[in-house]
């Protein structure tokens, strides 16, 4: 059966800075020469797009100027960056490959990642 | 919230053409899929076309590829079905949808008919 | 193409029933990609459930869903007068999309 199945880590921690990265790797059925990676929020039972790109293979993954995340791309594999992450930003992300280009289409989502983001304490005044 | 309004339908002969438009709001237009797919009197749902975010990206059903071509205005946030050679077979309620992040068409319009008669 | 087989054609049931309605894949539908719709006269179709078995936004939970590979079942716990509709299966985990041919459930 021609099936895309997509991996990515169940949790991960983000740093002091609310940065959190992981990889989203996927099997892919056919040769696809453009892809796109999307990353979703589930929080309760709402989903929204965190961020999106369109890369073709072997070229770099570009997101847009004003996106929160960055990342590169290795053969079935891509590593995403989540920077300005805050506490209230813990939740499920879900990566969601799908393979544009050439024909069949393909649509690949993972189980998610949870991410934990603990806001750092703040410095306290220090007396001199 | 997400509305999709279809228009454009109506009677038209074989062998002619039509352009339906399906209007959407209450989101961001190039975060999605947007499909058409449409309903025979009496039959079930077919999927028909789709189109993806930046608009590069069309597929078709078989039955009106070569005929039928999906396009979108992000500027205008519709989408288009321009419908050419058609044929009795292809008369039918044509629905636009939006395709959910997670899959499945989560939002649907209320369909617009189109009847090919001589 | 994957080809969707739908059963019964017609359930009749009364409010209060159960309603188990299947669908039957060609092959095996990625990752379980498949979607239940419900379809009223004069209507256009609305998402219960996405992923086999996940409930869209709004959707009572006496509509559940389950099954992987090829074949699916979309179960109404408990019939009330507004469920008695056509409901159709769609996979969407590749192209081109596909619906079943719909099972209409009306009273008995």
């Known amino acids: 059966c021609k099936a895309m199945h997509v991996a990515q880590p169940a949790v991960v921690l983000a740093s002091s800075r609310g940065i959190a990265s992981f990889v989203c790797e996927y099997a892919s059925p056919g040769k696809a020469t453009e892809v796109r990676v999307t990353v979703l929020r589930q929080a309760d039972s709402q989903v929204t797009e965190v961020c999106a790109a369109t890369y073709m293979m072997g070229n770099e993954l570009t997101f847009l100027d004003d996106s929160i995340c960055t990342g590169t791309s290795s053969g079935n594999q891509v590593n995403l960056t989540i920077q300005g992450l805050r506490a209230m930003d813990t939740g499920l992300y879900i990566c969601k490959v799908e393979l544009m280009y050439p024909p069949p289409y393909y649509l690949g989502i993972g189980n998610g990642t949870q991410i934990y983001v603990i806001d750092p304490e703040p410095c306290p005044d220090s007396d001199f | 919230q997400v509305q999709l309004v279809e228009s454009g339908g109506g009677v038209v002969q074989p062998g002619r053409s039509l352009r339906l438009s399906c209007t959407a709001s209450?989101?961001?237009?190039?975060?999605?899929?947007m499909d058409w797919v449409r309903q025979a009197p009496g039959k079930g749902l077919e999927w028909v076309a789709v189109i993806w975010y930046d608009g590069r990206n069309k597929y078709y059903a078989d039955s009106v590829k070569g005929r039928f071509t999906i396009s979108g205005d992000s500027s205008k946030n519709t989408l288009y079905l321009q419908m050419n050679s058609l044929r009795a077979e292809d008369t039918a309620v044509y629905y636009c949808?939006?395709?959910?992040?997670?899959?499945?068409?989560?939002?649907w319009g209320q369909g617009t008919l189109v009847t090919v008669s001589s | 193409e994957i080809v969707l087989t739908q059963s019964p054609g017609t359930l009749s049931l009364s409010p209060g029933e159960r309603a188990t309605l299947s669908c039957r894949a060609s092959?095996?539908?990625?990752?379980?990609?498949l979607a239940w719709y419900q379809q009223k006269p004069g209507q256009a179709p609305r998402l219960l459930i996405y992923?086999?078995?996940s409930r869209a936004t709004g959707i009572p939970d006496r509509f559940s869903g389950s099954g992987s590979g090829t074949d699916f079942t979309l179960t109404i716990s408990r019939l009330e007068p507004e469920d008695f509709a056509v409901y159709y299966c769609q996979q969407y985990g590749s192209s081109p999309f596909t619906f079943g041919p719909g099972t209409k459930v009306d009273i008995k």
């Open positions: 992923g086999a078995s």
């Open positions: 209450g989101f961001t237009f190039s975060s999605y899929g």
């Open positions: 949808a939006r395709g959910g992040l997670l899959g499945g068409f989560d939002y």
């Open positions: 092959q095996s539908v990625s990752s379980n990609y």
